[in-house]
């Protein structure tokens, strides 16, 4: 009786089961009562990544320097090329198939977690107490100068995008 | 018998240009991936250019982005390399090296060509 | 880009020894989807161009002898000549076939002592 289902890394065809291909192999003819399934492996900056049947390989990606890409791991048989960005520059979406400027955090705010060639810059805004004095990628928020510290008193309050303005103490006579 | 056969080398003035080819033959040259490699005399090995065997995908070094340009014809069973704006430190020896599509490495390497930039 | 450092950059064996050389990419070379470190060996002889010795760390290319080996993964691979030959002075070099630019080692020079 002709089987209805095959085992892993087989599949049903005319009633019969044929090997699948192994990564990096297209299908060239499925198998018969008399011969195997023929494969041939997958031509340069082609690949098949998983164990299939499929009669085409896929194309590497380009990972085009005018989009600002880069390659993070070279591409293989059994393997896509992965992409990542330049420096400074992060993907616009999972796939990476172009990139975008890291946002710097305007003044008043600080980085909460700086870009990755994945991620964009995180920004927060400056709690009482901080300040952020500049449109940055990479800076945080700082904290006040502390005037007591220095034996001062604060002469003009710290704002989000300040710092406090020290002076020294009035000494009566 | 894979055999890989760079031309075009010789003496060029600082900013000039010039032209190599590689010329493949005992392989099915538009089923490679081709490589330029190129080592300084006495020095080690350095990865110039890369294409992919249809022309697809095309990757440089940085130091010679923008200034050099990796190009193939498969029915010539050629490689070439264009070089502009050339510099004293591209002075080497240029190899053309092949890259198959299962080990993917450069598995075949021709003689080489000798490329002086000086004035 | 990868950084890949040779040790070391020479060394004199005698004849049927055993000679060992270092190569350490400044990245891991393995690739995620296969498993496989993609660490290449060169070997070049003197005035002649290099040839490929090893691939995916460890695979010898077709018709080089058994007496050379290679080992290691991620970071941290080595070249072995088990028995040194006449013919196996050369410049050895490590290259990372992981990613772009592709980057090779300094090269170590083996001599006969």
């Known amino acids: 009786e002709p089987p209805t289902a095959c085992r892993e890394k087989q599949y049903l065809i005319n009633s019969q089961c044929c090997s699948l291909c192994q990564p990096g192999q297209k299908l060239v003819s499925d198998c018969t009562e008399f011969t195997e399934t023929e494969c041939l492996p997958c031509g340069e900056s082609e690949f098949l990544d998983t164990w299939n049947r499929e009669t085409h390989c896929h194309q590497h990606k380009y990972c085009d320097p005018n989009l600002g890409l880069r390659v993070q791991q070279k591409g293989t048989s059994e393997t896509d090329t992965i992409c990542t960005c330049e420096e400074g520059w992060h993907c616009t979406s999972e796939a990476c198939e172009s990139c975008v400027l890291h946002r710097s955090c305007s003044p008043g705010f600080g980085v909460k977690q700086i870009a990755t060639g994945v991620s964009d810059t995180i920004c927060e805004p400056c709690p009482v107490g901080f300040f952020s004095n500049v449109s940055s990628a990479f800076e945080k928020c700082h904290p006040w100068t502390s005037c007591e510290t220095k034996d001062l008193v604060v002469q003009q309050a710290g704002t989000n995008k300040t710092d406090v303005v020290c002076g020294p103490q009035d000494r009566l006579r | 018998e894979v055999q890989l056969v760079e031309s075009g080398g010789g003496l060029v003035k600082p900013g000039g240009s010039r032209r190599l080819s590689c010329a493949a033959s005992g392989f099915t040259f538009s089923d490679y991936g081709m490589h330029w490699v190129r080592q300084a005399p006495g020095k080690g090995l350095e990865w110039v250019a890369y294409i992919s065997s249809g022309n697809r995908i095309i990757y440089y070094a940085d130091t010679v982005k923008g200034r050099f340009t990796i190009s193939r014809d498969n029915a010539k069973n050629s490689l070439y390399l264009q070089m502009n704006s050339l510099r004293a430190e591209d002075t080497a020896v240029y190899y053309c090296?092949?890259?198959?599509?299962?080990?993917?490495?450069?598995?075949?390497w021709g003689q080489g060509t000798l490329v002086t930039v000086s004035s | 880009d990868i950084v890949m450092t040779q040790s070391p950059d020479s060394l004199a064996v005698s004849l049927g020894e055993r000679v060992t050389m270092n190569c350490k990419s400044s990245q891991s070379l393995l690739n995620s989807g296969n498993q496989k470190n993609y660490l290449t060996w060169h070997q070049q002889k003197p005035g002649q161009p290099p040839k490929l010795l090893i691939y995916w760390t460890s695979t010898r290319e077709s018709g080089v002898p058994d007496r050379f080996s290679g080992s290691g993964s991620g970071t941290d691979f080595t070249l072995t000549i088990s028995s040194l030959q006449a013919e196996d002075v050369a410049v050895y070099y490590c290259q990372n076939d992981y990613t772009y630019p592709l980057t090779f080692g300094g090269g170590t020079k083996v001599e006969i002592k």
């Open positions: 090296a092949r890259q198959d599509g299962y080990r993917y490495a450069m598995d075949y």
